[in-house]
């Protein structure tokens, strides 16, 4: 029998290499049984995760999963950093692993580097 706990499917130590000026959708896959939980996004500032207020978010429904999406329209250099989604379920808070956005400002990069290069070259990133 499958668990009916809410589960948030963001992989530990996952990351996305993206470019300033591009649109980007950050997805939080949510598995639930009966009632869809309230889900929020926050951005890590040290050990504190600061809730993102007033941002464009949406839901996408697929067969076995729902996705709570944080929209970046467009990506800004200041969007660099780690994000976490949280679900409020039966008065409990379920937190996902954090996922990191590595933002490259195309103005400072003569050509777009590969994903691997970006993840291994912190001097391209904004803090």
């Amino acid at each position: 029998k499958e668990s009916c706990d809410v589960q948030l499917y963001i992989k530990r130590q996952s990351y996305h290499s993206i470019f300033a000026g591009d649109p980007f959708k950050l997805e939080c896959p949510v598995k639930y049984c009966a009632h869809r939980p309230q889900v929020t996004w926050c951005k890590l500032n040290g050990t504190t995760c600061v809730k993102l207020e007033g941002r464009h978010t949406s839901w996408k429904q697929e067969k076995n999963l729902s996705f709570f999406i944080l929209h970046f329209e467009p990506v800004l250099p200041s969007d660099n950093g780690s994000y976490r989604c949280s679900a409020n379920f039966l008065s409990a808070i379920i937190e996902s692993h954090s996922t990191t956005l590595y933002v490259t400002d195309v103005k400072s990069a003569s050509e777009r580097p590969s994903k691997d290069e970006m993840a291994s070259r912190p001097w391209l990133l904004y803090s």
Partner: antibody, heavy 119, light 112 residues
Framework: EVQLVESGGGLVQPGRSLRLSCTTS????????IHWFRQAPGKGLEWVGR????????KYTASFKGRATISADGSKSIAYLQMNSLKTEDTAVYYC????????????WGQGTLVTVSS | EIVLTQSPGTLSLSPGERATLSCRSS???????????LNWLQQKPGQAPRRLIY???KLDSGIPDRFSGSGSGTDFTLTISRLEPEDFAVYYC?????????FGQGTKLEIK
């Protein structure tokens, strides 16, 4: 039944390249990280790097960066390790392993494939 | 890079005895999510390793409960409460908190 089967090992000359395959079944590869490890004869285990089959992102140990490429084809449930400019000290058994990425719920290993680098 | 140091290098015991294996890390393995990603693997001659324990103390499915893991921060222990003949093998700790992931050098558990 869960299976990870490595293939592509064998005798290879120094300076040449080799591509190892890791064929998986019994789980969704996209829910996991695929790791490659190696073990030189009579020695301990060493982590080469890992791939996220869901998006292709990779991480490597510094000594393998630029010489090893880990990739995966999620639709075929196969992962690969490409090793270039092989040296005699790359002689080892190479293992792939699949670790669930969300809650650490499983960590499956293949049986390994022996790569011998010799002229 | 994190250095994991296992001790002893070799442990000679008899079936039925209790085995205590140590793994010490050069820095804390506590991740910012509050979890500690320290694993124990068992490897028998000519075989692939298999995961026994993850997150310091969680037992993999199918692993007998005579195996247990404990510790925090930088000091970790694998205990086998009552050795069975099939437990004689090499045991490795490895951490996947910090990149690059690293292994201890192994402890060989042999029959006395």
């Amino acid at each position: 039944e869960v299976q990870l089967v490595e293939s592509g090992g064998g005798l290879v000359q120094p300076g040449r390249s080799l591509r190892l395959s890791c064929t998986t079944s019994g789980f969704n590869i996209k829910d996991t990280y695929i790791h490659w490890f190696r073990q030189a004869p009579g020695k301990g285990l060493e982590w080469v790097g890992r791939n996220d089959p869901a998006n292709g992102n990779t991480k490597y140990t510094a000594s393998f960066k630029g010489r090893a490429t880990i990739s995966a084809d999620g639709s075929k449930s196969i992962a690969y390790l490409q090793m270039n400019s092989l040296k005699t000290e790359d002689t080892a058994v190479y293992y792939c392993a699949s670790y669930e990425g969300y809650y650490e719920r499983f960590g499956y290993w293949g049986q390994g494939t022996l790569v011998t680098v010799s002229s | 890079e994190i250095v994991l140091t296992q001790s002893p290098g070799t442990l000679s015991l008899s079936p039925g005895e209790r085995a205590t294996l140590s793994c010490r890390s050069s820095q804390s393995l506590l991740d910012r999510d509050g979890k500690t990603y320290l694993n124990w693997l068992q490897q028998k001659p000519g075989q692939a390793p298999r995961r026994l324990i993850y997150l310091v103390s969680k037992l993999d499915s199918g692993i007998p409960d005579r195996f247990s893991g404990s510790g925090s921060g930088t000091d970790f222990t694998l205990t086998i409460s009552r050795l069975e003949p099939e437990d004689f093998a090499v045991y490795y700790c490895w951490q996947d908190t910090h990149f690059p992931y690293t292994f201890g050098q192994g402890t060989k558990l042999e029959i006395k």
